[in-house]
Every structure is written in C-alpha cells, then in structure tokens.
C-alpha cells in the first residue's frame, strides 16, 4: 500500500536587509506566467549564494511570497512583481508561505516515534 503525501503549510514574516548585490533571490509566477496550476502566485525559484536571503537562511526555494512590505502580490503580472521587489527599499518585509512535504505511511501503520495514542 502506498503512503499518502501531505503538505504542512506555514506562514512566516521575514525581514531582509538589502545587501550589496540586493536581496539575492529569483522569482517565478504571476498572472502571465503561472508556475503552479491554477495559481498565479509568486514563488521563489532560486536563492543566490551569499546573497541577503541566503545569509538570513529563512527564505527557501519553493516558498510562495504573499506580500512585500504589506503589499499583496495577488493578481500581479510577473514584471510588476519583479518591479515591486526592486523598488521595495533597503529594509524589506516578506510574508511567505512555506509548504513542507510530509510523507505519511500506509493507513494503519504507525511510524517509529509516533504517539501510541
């Protein structure tokens, strides 16, 4: 019997300080470039080595960015989202959604370390 793949979704506020080479990450997504099916949201595609995001350590590739400095990223064209980041100033506050994959065992199987109930 195959295990079920579930996702644990958490949100986090990440405050970054723009470094000498900027914020140090790439994005995909937007209304004109859907990266996830039926979702025009903005996703982190690359974290650049030694950049501000990498040094901070909290932002991860695959994270969905919900807002920048309180401004919602819903229903934005890709380039408009890029411009929003570029014009976000020195101190940048990101509201992000982490989606962690949780591998569950077959139904009826209790993995090691699971509470016995």
């Amino acid at each position: 019997m195959n295990g079920r793949v579930d996702y644990l979704v958490t949100e986090e506020e990440i405050n970054l300080t723009r470094g000498p080479s900027g914020l140090g990450f790439n994005i995909v997504g937007g209304t004109d470039q859907q990266y996830v099916s039926n979702d025009s949201g903005i996703y982190v595609s690359r974290i650049k080595e030694n950049g501000a995001a990498a040094l901070d350590g909290r932002l991860q590739e695959g994270d969905k960015i919900l807002s920048v400095n309180g401004q919602d990223l819903k229903n934005l064209l890709h380039q408009d989202a890029v411009d929003l980041f570029r014009n976000a100033g020195y101190a940048v506050s990101l509201r992000v959604q982490h989606r962690l994959q949780v591998q569950n065992g077959p139904i009826g199987h209790r993995g090691e370390g699971d509470p016995s109930g």
Epitope: N26, S45, V82
Partner: nanobody, 125 residues
C-alpha cells in the same frame, strides 16, 4: 543535469550576418531567463542581449538595432541573430541560463546566472 551548448559561430566579413544558437537540456526553458554574453581577448565578459522568463528582450546599446534575440521553447533553443557585424563584435559568445527573474537586476547582469555554455567564437574580419 543542466547543459547549454552554443553553435553557429565562425568567420564573418564586416557588415555580414551570423546566427548563433543555444540549445538547452536538463530543464524546460519556459521559466528561465537566457542571456548572451561575449568576451573579447583581454577584456571582461559583457552582456549583449537576454530574454527574460516571460519573453521580454533586452539589449546593450552597442548592439541595439543590429542584434535580435529569440527563443523557441518547443525546441529548447535560444537564438541570437547578429546583423551589420563590426570588427569590435569579435569575441567568444556564451549563453547562460537562470531559473526565474532576479529581483535585483535585469537579465543583462552576468552575476545572476547559474548555468553557462562553453561558448562559440565569432570573428569579424
């Protein structure tokens, strides 16, 4: 494994044309920015043209109106058509790929790229 292979360079007369190609493998072009860069002997590598992940093209001033970048996602290939070539266009031409759009700089910035081809020589003489 990501791989970029350039082809199509060679010896061209001043005023002539050439098209260089960059074929990618190991990834789907759709979400990638692709840049063309060149390096002449004794000089630093410089951005020439690029096309971002949504198809917007950029050019440095020295090639505007002479060079045209295009992409064929179905063939996983990006082309750089170079017309009205000048001796100063002589260089090794490299293509590079980057996943998504940098939030820091346009795709003409070579520091943003993770993947590079081996280059193809274009000599205008």
């Amino acid at each position: 494994q990501v791989q970029l292979v350039e082809s199509g360079g060679g010896l061209v007369q001043p005023g002539g044309s050439v098209r260089v190609s960059c074929v990618s493998s190991g990834f789907i072009l759709d979400y990638y920015a692709i840049g063309w860069f060149r390096q002449a002997p004794g000089k630093e590598r410089e951005g020439v043209s690029c096309i971002d992940s949504v198809g917007r093209a950029y050019y440095v001033d020295s090639v505007k109106g002479r060079f045209t970048i295009s992409r064929d996602n179905a063939k996983n290939t990006v082309y750089l058509q170079m017309n009205s070539l000048k001796p100063e266009d002589t260089a090794v031409y490299y293509c590079a790929a980057d996943f998504g759009s940098s939030v820091d700089s346009t795709c003409l910035n070579n520091r943003q790229y993770d993947y590079w081809g081996q280059g193809t020589q274009v000599t205008v003489s």
